[in-house]
Interface confidence: low
């Protein structure tokens, strides 16, 4: 059996070498001479020759300094043979443990660590973690037991100890209130990692902490009072530019301004934010009326796109807006005036008065009236009073100028402001009908064939309106009834049928037809009748062709 005590060997030994480690023995040496040898890593396999054994005594020796961080354990096998070379023992595994020396200092995983923390962060807030490693033995020794400390903080404001580091984990946390990005946007910490729980070898690294922005600064008006002016009646006009400063990070929601008008219930103004410089642009949302209000005193508050992170006072500004008077056009009341008048209204008589009001109550202005459009030249107006009268006879049946019994005229009113302003009104004359038109036949020229003539329908037309129209009465006069007959074509008697009583010769005839409306207004019209050389329905007769060489040209 083997006798092998536990074997350990410190790394980095000074020597001299070879140096005895242990003596191994086989209790078979009582029976005869035993010779020892070793095999394995560090003996006969690389690194070869680190360990040797005295063949006869069994002394196991190390020949050079060991490095635990390269090889921490060596596994060898011991062999024992008799003088004739026969094995007297089975090979035995030998474990050689290299014990650690503190020959490695900690190494940070980065030279510079970067972290961030929100300004105003409370004590206890975790910021970042730094990490160091140590190649030494951290199981059996403190040679790799790293402790972290902060060596320095730059700047040392507002307190020289704004941060603390967990000795064991390397987690850096806030320890003091007062982180303020606007005062100190970055901190540079020199952190140390030392082994032997902080008492041994050490190394340093840098932790750069960026203090990130929160909305802890309000936008502040500077100045807080503004004046502007705007012409009346104009929307979307820039009145003034409001200036604010905000200490928070530019072009972030904590910096971007939102303006609110506190006393604009009518929604007459609007403030938009200039995205480039955060200015507030005050504009009119709708036209203002100088005559209603000449000055507005607006109170404008400014906040940010995101809410304040802490309790902050909202900055306000006062804007005085003067409304400028502008010469406004006179306004016809009503803008469209309807007047009913009979079409036989007397020439030169006043129909109506159509006047305009002057909006500029603060300017004493004179209004002058003119007729702008009067297509039939029927009207005239008093330039001072706006009284409108007829200059010619009205005619409801003048269908070129009258539509649906309505005659439209445009009137203008001009003030004497500077510049001159003109307003327009529309006058609608609703012309009531007078029975000033007798019925007329349509058509007045009629064609019949000589042979088998077809009766012809004649419509009766009256330009007036009921009751000055149908039912009509028709009568042939001046002996026309000798050759022709008429009869009514419909119950309203708005058309008649004309036909000859006998065969007529080809030629032209005149027939006198008396037509009378429902109010007995009558009129005799001459119908021109042509009898043509044809049969049935005549259409339109062709003129008789000249005869040449005694021959009739075929039709």
């Amino acid at each position: 059996d083997w006798v092998i005590p536990p074997i350990s060997c410190p790394e980095n030994e000074k020597g001299p070498f070879p140096k005895n480690l242990v003596q191994i023995k086989s209790n078979k040496d009582k029976e005869g001479k035993v010779f020892y040898s070793i095999t394995g890593q560090g003996a006969d396999t690389p690194p070869v020759g680190v360990f040797i054994i005295e063949r006869e005594t069994g002394w196991l020796k190390v020949t050079e300094p060991l490095d635990r961080e390269r090889i921490a354990t060596y596994t060898l096998f011991s062999h024992a043979v008799s003088s004739n070379g026969n094995a007297v023992e089975d090979p035995m595994e030998i474990l050689i443990t290299v014990t650690d020396q503190n020959d490695n200092k900690p190494e940070f995983t980065q030279e510079v660590f970067k972290g961030s923390v929100m300004e105003g962060a409370l004590p206890g807030t975790s910021v970042m973690e730094v990490t160091a490693t140590d190649a030494d033995d951290d199981v059996n020794t403190y040679n790799a037991a790293i402790a972290y400390t902060i060596l320095s903080q730059d700047p040392e404001l507002p307190d020289k100890n704004m941060f603390t580091i967990n000795r064991n984990t390397g987690v850096i946390s806030v320890v003091t209130t007062g982180l303020d990005r606007e005062s100190f946007p970055t901190y540079t910490l020199v952190v140390q990692a030392a082994d032997l729980q902080g008492e041994g070898l050490s190394t340093t690294a840098t932790a750069v902490i960026t203090v990130t922005d929160t909305n802890d600064n309000p936008p502040i008006f500077n100045p807080t009072t503004y004046k502007g002016q705007v012409p009346e009646n104009e929307a979307n006009v820039v009145i003034t530019t409001l200036k604010v400063t905000d200490a928070d990070a530019p072009n972030t929601p904590a910096w971007e301004a939102v303006y609110t008008i506190l006393n604009d219930d009518g929604g007459q103004f609007v403030v938009t934010t200039n995205p480039v410089n955060n200015d507030g642009i005050l504009k009119t949302a709708k036209g203002l009326d100088f005559e209603a209000k000449q000055q507005y005193i607006l109170h404008v508050a400014v906040t940010n796109v995101v809410p304040f992170e802490v309790s902050l006072t909202t900055s306000t500004a006062t804007v005085t807006v003067d409304v400028l008077d502008v010469n406004e056009a006179p306004i016809f009341v009503p803008p469209e005036k309807r007047v009913e008048v009979s079409e036989d209204f007397g020439v030169g008589q006043e129909i109506t008065s159509y006047t305009a009001q002057e909006p500029d109550t603060f300017m004493e202005q004179k209004i002058t009236y003119r007729i702008w459009r009067d297509t039939a030249n029927w009207l005239e107006i008093n330039p001072d009073t706006g009284a409108i009268s007829t200059r010619a006879e009205l005619d409801r049946e003048d269908f070129e100028h009258v539509k649906n019994s309505t005659y439209t005229a445009l009137i203008i009113a001009t003030d004497n402001g500077s510049p001159v302003a003109t307003g327009t009104g529309t006058l609608l004359l609703i012309l009531s009908d007078v029975n000033d038109n007798a019925p007329i036949p349509e058509p007045r020229t009629i064609f019949f064939c000589e042979r088998n003539p077809k009766p012809q329908v004649i419509n009766i037309i009256d330009a007036d309106l009921p009751p000055n129209t149908s039912p009509f009465t028709a009568e042939l006069t001046h002996g026309a009834s000798a050759n022709w007959t008429i009869q009514y074509n419909d119950p309203t008697q708005e058309s008649i049928i004309l036909k000859p009583k006998m065969a007529l010769e080809v030629g032209d005839y005149k027939i006198n037809l008396k037509l009378m409306d429902n109010q007995n207004k009558d009129q005799v019209t001459t119908l021109e009748v042509s009898v043509c050389d044809c049969e049935g329905a005549a259409g339109v007769c062709r003129k008789a062709q000249p005869v040449e060489a005694g021959l009739q040209i075929p039709a």
Epitope: T164, T176, V310
Partner: antibody, heavy 118, light 113 residues
Framework: QVQLQQSGNELVRPGSAVKISCKAS????????MNWVKQRPGQGLEWIGQ????????NYNGKFKGKATLTADKSSSSAYMHLSSLTSEDSAVYFC???????????WGQGTSVTVSS | DIVMTQSPSSLAMSVGQKVTMSCKSS????????????LAWYQQKPGQSPKLLIY???TRGSGVPDRFIGSGSGTDFTLTISSVQTEDLADYFC?????????FGGGTKLEIK
């Protein structure tokens, strides 16, 4: 101005539970710790715990773990304390108080009296 | 937990007199990195909520009259009212805010003669 308005006084049976509310106004509710403090009649003050509405982080006095549960609702700017398994020992006035140099309490609610009686 | 002890438990003073009351902690309330003592004083008038008087041992709260003076460091602290007024009738509590759970002293009752 900062105000903390607590819910009304409660008379409850032993073994039951109660939920006290504290509505905050006049400051950024999410950015300050809300503390809860107990005061028995004629006695001193006992800190129950605190909650940070911004992220619902909370800290408790070990004595009140399991007894008090703190919650907060940012949308209504309200903090709540739920007290369970009530006994006569829980009869007290309970205050909510804003923490600023945490947990220094600069503004206090008017207090809610809880009486546990059968 | 840090234990806070106040003395005396009560005292009666006349208007205009100087009042001092003591508060001791079972461990130091001085934070070496900030050099601040994490101790506060509160005043509670009868039937009212407590009101913050002093924090960080000596910093007066908003709107607190300057007759209230906080002093001390480490484990021994004092609240002084330089010239007591009738409206100062109240209970006074000290509180450590050095570590959680924060703890209060038993209070000092100030009566006006």
């Amino acid at each position: 101005q900062v105000q903390l308005q607590q819910s009304g006084n409660e008379l409850v049976r032993p073994g039951s539970a109660v939920k006290i509310s504290c509505k905050a106004s006049g400051y950024a509710f999410s950015s300050y710790w809300m503390n809860w403090v107990k005061q028995r009649p004629g006695q001193g003050l006992e800190w129950i715990g605190q909650i940070y509405p911004g992220d619902d982080d909370s800290n408790y006095n070990g004595k009140f773990k399991g007894k008090a549960t703190l919650t907060a609702d940012k949308s209504s700017s309200s903090a709540y304390m739920h007290l369970s398994s009530l006994t006569s020992e829980d009869s007290a006035v309970y205050f909510c108080a804003r923490g600023f140099a945490t947990p220094t309490m600069d503004y206090w609610g008017q207090g809610t009296s809880v009486t546990v009686s059968s | 937990d840090i234990v806070m002890t106040q003395s005396p438990s009560s005292l009666a003073m006349s208007v205009g007199q100087k009042v001092t009351m003591s508060c001791k902690s079972s461990q130091s309330l001085l934070n070496s990195s900030t050099q601040k003592n994490y101790l506060a004083w509160y005043q509670q008038k009868p039937g009212q909520s407590p009101k913050l008087l002093i924090y960080f041992a000596s910093t007066r709260g908003s709107g607190v009259p300057d007759r209230f003076i906080g002093s001390g460091s480490g484990t021994d602290f004092t609240l002084t009212i330089s010239s007591v007024q009738t409206e100062d009738l109240a209970d006074y509590f000290c509180q450590q805010h050095y570590s959680i759970p924060c703890t209060f002293g038993g209070g000092t009752k100030l009566e006006i003669k």
